[in-house]
């Protein structure tokens, strides 16, 4: 079964995923998707890396660890209840059926009615989007169909799996700035380099 992680509405959620590159800079493509890991790829892809860089991401989804060292943990910014569900981290190791895949269950709790005042970090300031407009997007649009989401009523609570989302804030401090180019001129929520 999936390992369970938690965050509160309005916080950032942290979903850990790691691998060990064969050599420094010798990266393996990784994808993150909403929904359990299918046989290939990652359900509805929200972020992916190639052998060099993060080449596709969507709004609110970030890699804040050092992905060049194999830390491909996902941060989801400012979560809502709709972010609950299963997420797939897939390490796409070349070869015959070599992929490693991990299903992580994210449980979002309603925000406390009277939260203690906390300092909100400026996520955009910490990780500015370095955007250019290199206009070659996908040659055709794929309709994203309905993919597996977990029903909130089915989610069990595992107290020992609690992940304080403030930990994710601390981890961000050592993260690398992610640069990308926007290929969707009319959609600020999707950013990617083409993968060729």
């Amino acid at each position: 079964s999936e390992v369970e992680y938690r965050a509160e509405v309005g916080q950032n959620a942290y979903l850990p995923c790691f691998y060990t590159p064969a050599a420094p800079g010798n990266l393996v493509p990784v994808c993150w998707g909403k929904g359990a890991c299918p046989v290939f790829e990652c359900g509805n892809v929200v972020l992916r890396t190639d052998e060099r860089d993060v080449n596709y991401w969507t709004s609110r989804y970030w890699l804040n660890g050092d992905f060049r060292k194999g830390d491909v943990s996902l941060t989801i910014e400012n979560v809502t209840l709709a972010d609950s569900g299963i997420y797939c981290c897939r390490i796409q190791i070349p070869g015959i059926m070599n992929d490693e895949k991990f299903n992580l269950k994210l449980v979002i709790k309603p925000a406390k009615v009277t939260p203690a005042p906390t300092r909100q970090r400026d996520f955009t300031a910490a990780f500015p989007r370095m955007l250019t407009t290199r206009g070659h997007g996908p040659a055709e649009t794929q309709t994203l169909g309905s993919l597996p989401d977990i029903n909130l009523t089915q989610i069990s609570t595992l107290a020992n799996e609690l992940r304080d989302s403030r930990l994710a804030n601390d981890l961000r401090d050592s993260g690398a700035t992610i640069r990308g180019s926007s290929d969707y001129k009319d959609d600020d929520d999707k950013h990617h380099h083409h993968h060729h």
Epitope: V39, V45, I86, G95, N98, S146, L147
Partner: antibody
Framework: EVQLVESGGGLVQPGGSLRLSCAAS????????MAWVRQAPGKGLEWVAN????????YYLDSLKSRFTISRDNAKNSLYLQMNSLRAEDTAVYYC???????????????WGQGTLVTVSS | DIQMTQSPSSLSASVGDRVTITCRAS??????LAWYQQKPGKAPKLLVY???TLAEGVPSRFSGSGSGTDFTLTISSLQPEDFATYYC?????????FGQGTKLEIK
């Protein structure tokens, strides 16, 4: 219009080899996983193999991976299946199919070729 | 391997009938299920993917439902061109596997 056209089928003796080809057009070939699926005469569908966008990752039916090799040439928009040590039970129509794309989402073989018949017999 | 079991194996129905074909997976496949229609001598045609999303160009009389292990394909009002063999297929575990097929015949 998306088109997949298989070729290379035919009659081959047991123990022989064949190389099937699939020519793709009408879409960005390198944006999609591709697959081979086969169907023995009067039988159901059986998945054979898949390959990722650039050919670096391949996936096989366990019983076939020592004899069959899937590959692709994105510059030629072509998919291949090298079949060695063929057996009578490999007799089937072999279909080339387009699988999931670069952004995920659509899990199903959306487009199929017309198929090419491979007959293994002495 | 994940086994896909379709029922019934064959079915006789009349034009205008409502028909339901079921597919059961031996393990949880979430919603990674596709349905295909195949006519004799032709390649299969994708009808539904991700359990309930209708493929492009497929008439709205076809619908898919289910998740986890139990899935259904429903044809709300059979048309003459719908008589064919139908297959389900899972895209969750390796190897990819198909159901054995359901042959839909004219009564």
């Amino acid at each position: 219009e998306v088109q997949l056209v298989e070729s290379g089928g035919g009659l081959v003796q047991p123990g022989g080899s064949l190389r099937l080809s699939c020519a793709a057009s009408g879409f960005t070939f390198s944006d999609y996983y591709m697959a081979w699926v086969r169907q023995a005469p009067g039988k159901g569908l059986e998945w054979v193999a898949n390959i990722n966008y650039d050919g670096s990752s391949t996936y096989y039916l366990d019983s076939l991976k020592s004899r069959f090799t899937i590959s692709r040439d994105n510059a030629k928009n072509s998919l291949y299946l090298q079949m060695n040590s063929l057996r009578a039970e490999d007799t089937a129509v072999y279909y080339c199919a387009r699988d999931v794309g670069y952004y995920g989402g659509n899990y199903g073989f959306a487009y199929w070729g017309q198929g090419t018949l491979v007959t293994v017999s002495s | 391997d994940i086994q896909m079991t379709q029922s019934p194996s064959s079915l006789s129905a009349s034009v205008g009938d409502r028909v339901t074909i079921t597919c059961r997976a031996s393990d949880n496949i979430y919603s990674y299920l596709a349905w295909y229609q195949q006519k004799p001598g032709k390649a299969p045609k994708l009808l539904v993917y991700n359990a309930k999303t209708l493929a492009e160009g497929v008439p709205s009389r076809f619908s898919g439902s289910g998740s986890g292990t139990d899935f259904t394909l429903t044809i709300s009002s059979l048309q003459p061109e719908d008589f064919a063999t139908y297959y389900c297929q899972q895209h969750y575990g390796s190897p990819l596997t198909f159901g054995q097929g359901t042959k839909l015949e004219i009564k």
